[in-house]
């Protein structure tokens, strides 16, 4: 059974992931972003189901495409270089989903823009955090 300290750690990691995803969304989905329209041409795959931490496997598999979009952005939009930002997210995702069980991600048929993709994972983080508090 999860201890209160492990639950707290999970919550903090989810909050960190949530803040990173929100920062990316705010930096991108903004008319002041000169590359916005081109960023919206990138296609992302969405999870068929995202209700548990193991489903973060689906986010992990889309981090490389996410980095490619961020490479288009101006560095002033974010505090970190895309590679470093994605690396940080990857570390959190790996810790949260765990590596004990191998989970095969199932994707929905519909693809999504980067804005829809980020909003989906932001909602996921918020949903899991609410169950922990």
């Amino acid at each position: 059974a999860p201890t209160s300290s492990s639950t707290k750690k999970t919550q903090l990691q989810l909050e960190h992931l949530l803040l990173d995803l929100q920062m990316i969304l705010n930096g991108i989905n903004n008319y002041k972003n000169p590359k916005l329209t081109r960023m919206l041409t990138f296609k992302f795959y969405m999870p068929k189901k995202a209700t548990e931490l193991k489903h973060l496997q689906c986010l992990e598999e889309e981090l490389k495409p996410l980095e490619e979009v961020l490479n288009l952005a101006q560095s002033k939009n974010f505090h970190l270089r895309p590679r470093d930002l994605i690396s940080n997210i990857n570390v959190i995702v790996l810790e949260l989903k765990g590596s004990e069980t191998t989970f095969m991600c199932e994707y929905a048929d519909e693809t999504a823009t980067i804005v829809e993709f980020l909003n989906r994972w932001i909602t996921f983080c918020q949903s899991i955090i609410s169950t922990l508090t």
């Epitope: 008319y31 002041k32 000169p34 916005l36 329209t37 919206l40 041409t41 990138f42 288009l72 823009t113």
Partner: antibody, heavy 119, light 108 residues
């Protein structure tokens, strides 16, 4: 309604200059990046240049780099294309087009203006 | 330089289905957009993000994408659908904006 109205086309000799204008109405012009797209007679569409909402970022196709300059006056809701050192291959219908902020394409187009470069 | 490849022309009878293809190496990770351009007019967006239809575009227009191929389908083509159709997207890095060469659809 949302509208882009173009002016300034015409016939010009090779090596000469021409300026096109695109007047926007029905939306907050200063919130949108804008583009110029051209179409040579009987040919396909070719993106030419783009300019950010505030004019700070400009990009050009290799075919016009160093010869064409795009600019905007947000107080007049107007986009411009200054074309210098014109060549015969610049002969085309020029369209101004708005960058969408919700999808990855051009969502509003001007009516087009013909530029003919001929001696 | 990145290219999107379309067939130059297609002819169908009214009521038939018209299928226009657009091939591009980046399509597994890039959305396709389709513009209709009638003679002497500016282009009009008829499909965005592979499959989505802007408001005001008839239901007979649909889009799909699989692998490196995007497809525009007009089910039950009408005489008023006669036009040039251009696919549009960006290259692999998203840096360059690219149009296909266009397909002239004749409905007669």
């Amino acid at each position: 309604q949302v509208q882009l109205v173009q002016s300034g086309g015409g016939v010009v000799q090779p090596g000469r200059s021409l300026r096109l204008s695109c007047a926007a109405s029905g939306f907050t012009f200063s919130n949108y990046a804008m583009n110029w797209v051209r179409q040579a007679p009987g040919k396909g569409l070719e993106w030419v240049t783009s300019i950010s909402y505030d004019g700070a970022n400009r990009e050009y196709a290799d075919s016009v780099k160093g010869r064409f300059t795009t600019s905007r006056d947000n107080s007049k809701n107007t986009l411009y294309l200054q074309m210098n050192s014109l060549r015969a291959e610049d002969t085309a219908v020029y369209y101004c087009a708005r960058d969408s902020t919700t999808l990855g394409a051009f969502d509003v187009w001007g009516q087009g203006t013909m530029v003919t470069v001929s001696s | 330089s990145y290219e999107l490849t379309q067939p130059p022309s297609l002819s169908v009878s009214p009521g038939q289905t018209a299928t226009i293809s657009c091939s591009g190496d980046a399509f597994p990770r890039k959305f396709a957009y389709w513009y209709q351009q009638k003679s002497g007019q500016a282009p009009v967006l008829v499909i965005y993000e592979d499959t989505r239809r802007p408001s005001g575009i008839p239901e007979r227009f649909s889009g799909s994408s699989s692998g490196t191929m995007a497809t525009l389908t007009i089910s039950g083509a009408q005489v008023e659908d006669e036009a040039d159709y251009f696919c549009y997207s960006t290259d692999t890095t998203g840096t360059h904006r690219v149009f296909g060469g266009g397909t002239k659809l004749t409905v007669l």
